[in-house]
Each structure stands twice: as C-alpha cells, then as structure tokens.
C-alpha cells in the first residue's frame, strides 16, 4: 500500500502567441481546483477501468478576479497535495489525467457552476520511494507545471511497495540474511516466510509461519473470497462470517468498496454504490457534497449541502458513472449510413452525409439522375450515390454508349445458334426444340409443349427474341 502524491506548481498561459483569456472576470470571479485520475499500465488497454488506480480532487483555490487589461497570469492555486492512496502494489507504469476545473462564483441559479478548463494526460514509469519527478504539460494555450511521486506506507517498502519492513531487533545489524530497509536504515526487511501456500495476492504475514488475510478474503491460506451471498453463516457471538467458495476471482471479490460501499460487477470492471457522505471509485473520499463539485463533464449535482447528505449526479448525454466520469462514444457502431461521418455533439448525434445522400442517418438516396443522360435510349436509375443507366437492347456501358453483343452470353439453349439482330438476338433452334431461346422441347407427335405457337411461327423456325 502507498500514496501517489501530486503537487501543482503553476497553471497559466503557455509560451508563444495566442495567450488565453483569463477564465475569471470582475463580473464573474472564480477559483480553480484540480482532479487527478490514475490508471495502471502504459497503454490505454492496460486500464481495467476508469481511474482504476484511484482518483482525487484538490481543495478549491483562492478566489480570483481578473484585473482589467492585464494578461492572464498564473492563476492562484489550491494549497496542499493531491493524494491518491493505493491499496495494492504500485504498478511502476501508469497513465494519468489531470483536469483543471473552474468554479464560477457569480450569482448562479442553483449554486456554483463548474467547467473544465484544461485536461492533460500522459504515461510514465515511476518507482515508488523515488524522488519527486517534475513535469510540464500543455493543453491548448494553457500550461500546467507539476511534480509527482509514489511513496509506500509503512511497513511496506520497495519500488512496488511489496516488501515489508520492521524495526531492528538489535541496534547494530539486521538478522541473518536480511537487508536494511533503504532509505529507512534503522529498519530491516521483514522475512516474508509466511505459511506455505499463503496467497501472495490476498494474504500476508507479520510473523513467520502465519497467513493473515486482506479484507474480503478468508480461509487458512486466504484463498476463499468472503461472499455476500446467502451462504454466509454466523460464527460465534460476534456474528463474524465464514467464507463461501465462489469459483473464479471477480472484481467484487474481497469488496474493493471502502466505507461500507456495496460492489456491483459491471461489464468490464466494478462499480461502488457509496453510502451517504462518500464518493469516489471505491467510496474512498468522504464528506463530499454538491459544494465539492463531484459531478464531472457538466453533470448536474443534486443533493443537500451538509456533509451527511447524499448527492446524485445527473449526467449529460454521452456520459455515465456515479460522477459522470465515463464517456460513451455513441459513434462507435457507425450509425451513419452510406459512408456518412458521425459527430457526437454531446447533446445529440449528427451525421455529415456524403454527396448524394441525406437524412438524419444519411439513409435517403438523393436523385442521382438530375442532369444525367443515358445514350441510345437508356434510362437513368438512381442509387448508391451515383447514377446508373439501364440500357436498351444492344447497348451497354456506364452511359449506354457501347454496342453490346447480345450473343456473348450464349442465350440459345440446347445447341441453338445465336444471331445478332437490330432488335436484339435471334435463336435458330436445333431440331426438336423451339421457343424464343430454344428452351422448349417439341413433342414427338409435333405438338408443342406450349399452349399454342404464335401465328405464323412453326416449331423449328428461328425464334426472334425481342
């Protein structure tokens, strides 16, 4: 376990032309606050959920009012560090998002208004216990300067906060085979000789040979998740519960929700439903009310102003989550037809249609034939965003300008011979067959299989196909 710490040094206009306008004015004083979101791993796919390592909100900065005519200076910042506690090992590689939020303090109907000024993101390698790392990130015309570090909470030490340290038993040196705990030279690395088979993920030991379980796990080797299902049974006067075997680890096994929050599995992660007065991915932030602005991305906060009062975030379209922190890409399933470009405007989806198409989803095919001509008596057929010609017999090609060979497809059946003709083609049928394409056998007695041959046409005569 440990804490990620973020120190904001400055937030103000970046170098170069196009300095941003001050976010505050005499008419509309405001103050800043920051939000940090941490995810494990260096790639987007490594993040199991939004802010899977944790998130934190800063305090509000001092109220700032722009001096008329003055350029936007570095804006006054909140005091103190942003601290994101982590319960498990520090992953070493992480992604961060730091958001700068503006709280407007003018006469707002329904309380203060929040808006996102800037968002910076990055991916970094960082060993726990190391020195402060300095960073500069730019978002548009704004520049954010900050430092960060990860430190272990005693008794954990090491670059991942997975080693345990204990005070020295003797003043001069550590026990046999044990190293001093740098930088805590007066402490020694604890021997991690737990009971054989003790779960390395869910168990730990403070004395050799023991196996103590992390919250949510039970059993002699801490391999059994404590279930919240009906199989719990009381044990002794304290009504403590025995574990239930639930196959396969799930994100709610070992309940990651703090402060009495209840855990629900989501399609890829988990979600904590927090009791009144708590919020955060794991209900780890306490005493939050609407005055703290817990709703992101323009979410509307509804709830009382006293610390014990719950709040609810009503999210705008395109966002969800208990704090409106999850963005939904509604264009992902390509709702625009016929190659239209999808635009998620937040309040609505819009499709920008290719030429020849229209409609909310580009589903309507416009008249492609306007101003188009098909040669040699062809007729224009619209469709697919481009005009097509249905050509008269004997012609082909895109505009019916090419002469077609009607016999190319061998249309005469049963060995009939094909002759090109000004009005199409003529089939000279082999003996025993008749019809426009020689498709009908002539009965042995000379009667046709057809009801009657057209006047002036005898079986065996060449048939002209019109």
């Amino acid at each position: 376990a440990g804490v990620f710490e973020l120190q904001i040094h400055s937030f103000g206009p970046g170098p170069g032309p196009g300095a941003p306008r001050s976010p505050c004015s005499a008419r509309l004083p405001c103050r800043l606050f920051f939000r940090v979101c941490l995810k494990p791993g260096l790639s987007e796919e490594a993040a199991e959920s939004p802010c899977a390592l944790g998130a934190a909100l800063s305090a509000r900065g001092p109220v700032y009012t722009e001096q008329p005519g003055a350029p936007a200076p570095d804006l006054p910042l909140p005091d103190g560090l942003l601290q994101v506690p982590f319960r498990d090992a520090w992953p070493g590689t992480f992604s961060f998002i730091i958001e700068t939020w503006r709280e407007e303090l003018g006469d707002q109907i329904g309380g203060p208004a929040w808006s996102l000024l800037a968002r910076v993101a990055g991916r970094r390698r960082l060993a726990a216990g190391g020195p402060w790392a300095r960073d500069i990130q730019r978002a548009g015309a704004w520049e954010l300067r900050f430092s960060y570090r990860a430190r272990c909470e005693p008794p954990a030490v090491g670059t991942a906060c997975t080693r345990l340290c204990r005070p020295r038993s003797a003043p001069s040196r550590c026990g046999p085979g044990l190293r001093p705990c740098a930088p805590l030279e007066d402490e020694c690395e604890a021997p991690l000789v737990c009971r054989a088979g003790c779960s390395p993920e869910h168990g730990f030991c403070e004395q050799p040979g023991e196996c103590r379980c992390l919250e949510g796990w039970t059993g002699p080797l801490c391999t059994v998740p404590v279930s919240t299902s009906s199989c719990l049974s009381p044990r002794g006067p304290s009504s403590a519960t025995t574990g239930c075997l639930v196959p396969g680890p799930g994100p709610c096994d070992g309940n990651p929700c703090a402060n009495g929050g209840s855990c629900s599995e989501t399609p890829r992660s988990f979600e904590c439903t927090c009791p009144r007065g708590f919020y955060g991915l794991r209900c780890e932030v306490s005493g939050v009310t609407c005055a703290d602005g817990p709703c992101f991305n323009g979410g509307l906060c509804v709830g009382g102003a006293d610390p014990d009062s719950a709040y609810i975030c009503h999210c705008p379209p395109g966002f969800q989550g208990s704090n409106c922190e999850k963005r939904v890409d509604r264009c992902s399933l390509q709702p625009c037809r016929n190659g239209g470009l999808c635009l998620d405007l937040g309040h609505a989806l819009r499709c920008r249609c290719r030429a020849g198409f229209a409609g909310p989803r580009c589903e309507h095919d416009l008249d492609d034939c306007a101003g188009r001509a098909c040669a040699n008596g062809g007729t224009c057929v619209e469709g697919g965003g481009a005009h097509r010609c249905s050509c008269a017999l004997g012609f082909g090609g895109r505009d019916c300008r090419e002469r077609a060979d009607p016999c190319a497809a061998r249309p005469c059946a049963h060995g009939g011979r094909c002759y090109a003709h000004f009005s199409g083609l003529v089939c000279a049928c082999a003996p025993g067959y008749m019809g426009a394409r020689c498709e009908f056998p002539v009965h042995p007695d000379g009667a046709s299989a057809l009801p009657a041959a057209p006047p002036g046409l005898r079986p065996g005569d060449p048939q002209r196909y019109l």
Epitope: R268, K326, L333
Partner: antibody
C-alpha cells in the same frame, strides 16, 4: 460480413456437462473492444444472459450460475467455449452466442450480432 | 439484481398504428438496449445506448428515456414489425433482460 455459429450436443443427460462452442468470423477477439457473450432462452420464455468474455480475457458470469459456468476463448481459432456443469432439465433452452462491442472501457456499445442458436434438451 | 419490467406484456395493433413499449428498471441503468425477436429466429439488435438505431433498422423505430424509465416507439407499424421485443440493461451483473412484449396483429 460478421457471422457467429453455435455448436454442441443437442441432447444431454441430467448431471452431465454441456460444452458449447461459438465459432465466429468477420471480427477478431484480439481487437480491443470486442467480446463474445452467451445468452439462453428456454422454450416460450425470456432471454437470460449467462456469461461473456472480452478481448483481454476479462470474464463475467451470471451470479446465479457462476459456480457451474466456465467461459474461455481461442483467439487463433476465432472460437469461444462455454461449459456448464451439472445440467438439469430446467436448463433446456436455445443457447445463443453474440458479439459484444465496448469502445468505452466499461460501457457496452451493443450486442450487435447473434448466432442462429442451438437448442439443447436436458433429459434422461 | 436489477429487475427489468416491460409493459405491456402483449399488445394488439394494426398496420399504420403508433406503438409504444416501456421498460422500467428497478434502479438507474444509464442506458437501455432493445431487441426484436421473431418466432424461431435469433434476437436482432434494434436500439443501442438508449436512442441509437442499429445498422439496417428502419427509422420508424426510436428509443428514449433515462435513469429507470425507457421507451421504444414504432411510429407507423408495418407487417414485418409483429414480433416480441426485449429490453436489456448493461449496468450491473447480472445483465438482465425484460420479460418481453409480444406485438400481435389486430
């Protein structure tokens, strides 16, 4: 063109284990955002979600059936396998597999393509 | 578990009618998904993320709602629309479906 097809036994005896395979084409479970789920429908009844698996091997099971279900994927074969132990006549149903898409980390975009389904009867 | 309750359970209507099916969730679900199923066939996705039309679905279908109450509307019923319709939530496990609404020809 995206297609999914379920295969497996049509008749199983009570207490036996059912193994169903979903073979799909037109997308890959090595692509970020892709998943495959299993849904069943007893004759004349409503749909019931059973389990799903994502490209990065994140799995979810219906809590009421979790102890009996196992879902696995073979990315190279474009297959997802569901096993269900200790079958009972009440498990008689048409079993469907379907593609699930999630482009937003934890928000499902849609379960947009379904297999034709395979009817599994549990009877001695 | 989040319970999904559809109403009505069955509905008789005529070609050209405007039809509305509602789905009520026992707790907030953020988004709703709607499927159409015809006898002997697999379900087909109609609406995703509450109001977005799936590919190839006619524009007479529309979805709306938020929180716990959602609606599927067919603006002018066509012969091919007579089927059973299901809603589904993807918020919390188990990812439950409604009991279905059977739309029959009057």
């Amino acid at each position: 063109q995206i297609t999914l097809k379920e295969s497996g036994p049509t008749l199983v005896k009570p207490t036996q284990t059912l193994t169903l395979t979903c073979t799909f084409s037109g997308f890959s479970l090595s692509t970020s955002g892709m998943g495959v789920g299993w849904i069943r429908q007893p004759p004349g009844k409503a749909l019931e979600w059973l389990a799903h698996i994502w490209w990065d091997d994140v799995k979810r099971y219906s809590p009421s059936l979790k102890s009996r279900l196992t879902i696995t994927k073979d990315t190279s074969k474009n297959q997802v396998v569901l096993t269900m132990t200790n079958m009972d006549p009440v498990d008689t149903a048409t079993y469907y597999c379907a593609r699930i898409v999630s482009f937003d980390n934890d928000v499902v975009s849609a379960m947009d393509y379904w297999g034709q389904g395979t009817l599994v009867t549990v009877s001695s | 578990d989040i319970q999904m309750t559809q109403s009505p359970s069955s509905l008789s209507a005529s070609v050209g009618d405007r039809v509305t099916i509602t789905c009520s969730a026992s707790s907030s679900v953020s988004y709703m998904y709607w499927y159409q199923q015809k006898p002997g066939k697999a379900p087909k996705l109609l609406i995703y993320l509450t109001s977005n039309l799936a590919s190839g679905v006619p524009s007479r279908f529309s979805g709306s709602g938020s929180g716990t109450d959602f609606t599927l509307t067919i603006s002018s019923l066509q012969p091919e629309d007579f089927a059973t319709y299901y809603c589904q939530q993807w918020r919390h496990n188990p990812f439950t479906f409604g009991q279905g609404t059977k739309l029959e020809i009057k």
